[in-house]
Amino acid sequence: SEVEYRAEVGQNAYLPCFYTPAAPGNLVPVCWGKGACPVFECGNVVLRTDERDVNYWTSRYQLKGNFYKGDVSLTIENVTLADSGIYCCRIQIPGIMNDEKFNLKLVIKPAKVTPAPTRQRDFTAAFPRMLTTRGHGPAETQTLGSLPDINLTQISTLANELRDSRLANDLRDSGATIRIG
């Protein structure tokens, strides 16, 4: 399933991507790229992490969540229409064909001329609430055989996090469209 996110020109856009390290700080490499996920890595890399830290990023692309707990969600600051498109989040899990690949569609709308209603919030401010949301869909668990110290519960998409969630309406008001396929 493809998940679609919307933001207005000039706003910050938030593209969620998560995994659960076996232990805090037991990290795996992650890359973000513009374009659908290819066979390996990410195309047109905009941000990359290794087992310790963010080791490559460009100015408007940031991780603002708790990277050390597996929140590798991407924030794109001050978006323009050119930021529209598919983004790939790739979680490079050791083992045979274990990489998690997520394609997220970002739609940028022209800025509204009229003042925004008070109901609408900054996209970035709206989404951190989701980190405390209890997922209602079953989590997908992967045990990586004999690989040491890694047993990841993948949060496969934001759609799983939000399935049947009362936040869905809130998010729709914030401009996010969740398509569960």
């Epitope: 890595e41 490079q92 274990n98």
Partner: antibody, heavy 120, light 107 residues
């Protein structure tokens, strides 16, 4: 500059296991940024990607060989290897090891290739 | 798996001429297409990645174009060392696949 060198027996009997090693020089196999791969080329034919192992430990095998294939890394020897079990004459090929730069895919390095013949 | 069809199978040209090689994918590969050159007895050499980006050290006479399903490798003016077999490779979907190759030979 990274250099790669394949080694292993040039002749393997049918039903046995083909084992090849690729020795990496000019760089550490455990440092980030490279994918270590195997590709083969049947005599007079085109190229067939076999699989890769990444700097992070991600491993991908081509589906047609997956059940017979193992790719692994030995960081202490700066080598990675290929094992292909239950070989037949159809596995006769030149086997190439290669590394791909993951930081934009703008360069890769290949070994010179080694011919493996499967015959009794 | 994605099938890559290269045409023509053989291209007979003289040094200094322009070579145009085609690669067509059975489904979209976005821009995740690479071109390799292979000479007899040698390993393949990466020329172009992501459809249009020249790899490190590749001369400017090599250029790539296209996206989706149709791609072209152009050699603007053939040098003697350019006569070889050229393969396209898609990196969009697993398994990675190569085209059958185009042989550029001296006319």
């Amino acid at each position: 500059q990274v250099q790669l060198q394949e080694s292993g027996p040039g002749l393997v009997k049918p039903s046995q296991t083909l084992s090849l090693t690729c020795t990496v020089s000019g760089g550490s196999i455990s440092s980030g940024g490279y994918y270590w791969s195997w590709t083969r080329q049947h005599p007079g034919m085109g190229l067939e990607w076999i699989g890769y192992i990444s700097y992070s430990g991600s491993i991908y095998y081509t589906p047609s060989l997956k059940s017979r294939l193992t790719i692994s890394v030995d960081t202490s020897k700066n080598q990675f290897s290929l094992k292909l079990s239950s070989v037949t004459a159809a596995d006769t090929a030149v086997y190439y090891c290669a590394s791909l730069d993951s930081w934009g895919s703008n360069r890769d390095y290949w070994g010179q290739g080694t011919l493996v013949t499967v015959s009794s | 798996e994605i099938v890559l069809t290269q045409s023509p199978a053989t291209l007979s040209l003289s040094p200094g001429e322009r070579a145009t090689l085609s690669c067509r994918a059975s489904q979209s590969v976005s821009s995740y297409l690479a071109w390799y050159q292979q000479k007899p007895g040698q390993a393949p050499r990466l020329l172009i990645y992501d459809a249009s980006n020249r790899a490190t050290g590749i001369p400017a006479r090599f250029s790539g174009s296209g996206s989706g399903t149709d791609f072209t490798l152009t050699i603007s003016s053939l040098e003697p060392e350019d006569f070889a077999v050229y393969y396209c490779q898609q990196r969009s979907n697993w398994p990675l696949t190569f085209g059958g190759g185009t042989k550029v030979e001296i006319k």
